[in-house]
Interface confidence: low
């Protein structure tokens, strides 16, 4: 279970990083990036990797460049492996990254945060029962 807990900690850290980057959204290159939304069950890990692969970049405007680049680098770090992550269901062909709607950085980050929250929720609900509205 330790791997799972490490994984949850990492997911929460990623949410913090996304929130931090949202504060600097005007300092990001206003490029449209594939932003998965309403991700199909068991294609979540595929969508997660699409967010990580996206070319989110600092616009190199002033003092915030270093903190933005550090945050983007942290976003791209692989999370600790879990059974569920390793074993993305091979019976489904998940949409390619390019097939997802492209959005500017603000919406991209909002959708990434939404997926991370869903990821945490699903992992927790795989371990406990009871009300799951959150």
């Amino acid at each position: 279970m330790q791997g799972q807990d490490r994984h949850m900690i990492r997911m929460r850290q990623l949410i913090d990083i996304v929130d931090q980057l949202k504060n600097y959204v005007n300092d990001l290159v206003p490029e449209f990036l594939p932003a998965p939304e309403d991700v199909e069950t068991n294609c979540e890990w595929s969508a997660f990797s699409c967010f990580q692969k996206a070319q989110l970049k600092s616009a190199n405007t002033g003092n915030n460049e270093r903190i933005i680049n550090v945050s983007i680098k942290k976003l791209k770090r692989k999370p600790p492996s879990t059974n569920a992550g390793r074993r993305q269901k091979h019976r489904l062909t998940c949409p390619s990254c390019d097939s997802y709607e492209k959005k500017p950085p603000k919406e991209f980050l909002e959708r990434f945060k939404s997926l991370l929250q869903k990821m945490i929720h699903q992992h927790l609900s795989s371990r406990t029962h009871g009300s799951e509205d959150s």
């Epitope: 068991n42 074993r87 019976r91 959150s134």
Partner: antibody, heavy 120, light 107 residues
Amino acid sequence: EVQLVESGGGLVKPGGSLRLSCAASGFIFSSYSMNWVRQAPGKGLEWVSSITSGSYYIHYADSVKGRFTISRDNAKNSLYLQMNSLRAEDTAVYYCVRERGWGYYGMDVWGQGTTVTVSS
Amino acid sequence: AIQLTQSPSSLSASVGDRVTITCRASNDIDSALAWYQQKPGKAPKILIHDASSLESGVPSRFSGSGSGTDFTLTISSLQPEDFATYYCQQFNSYPYTFGQGTKLEIK
């Protein structure tokens, strides 16, 4: 409380139609794949159909392909099974079932079942 | 379709006994298997997911093992409430399939 409640079962003549509904509550319905599983009287469990969270992937057992249609309305937290050209062998208790996501294998929440009887 | 064969089909045992039910898949299904318990007139209840992960709230006397084609459900010390029918189910590929069931009866 996590709950699935089926409705719509009943007695129908061979060749007839029926629409089963399943109302979900207590969890984020739009995040999960859903299934219909049936059990004929005195028999084992038989998987009938599956639909993923956004209806992108739909699958059916060979025994119902072309006759049954699964659908869902995430805004209404509801799952449906439209059953046409019903046969005597479709007589069973039909369960609405939640399937885990994220690569976990198992159906963790089951409804109480609704009975479908096909008889002349 | 992947076939699951459970053995035995029925089993008589006493309270306190250790019981093992096996499920054999016609193809390699990795660990994409779950075990369920069903009592008469009730919906099935999940016991084990991912072949060996105990479901939350299920007593620790239940355990699952196996990977590939051979899987086992073990009840270490039977309790009166464990007399029921047990099913395995594979999730490796569609159509999903269940084993035919194992009925566990009181000796």
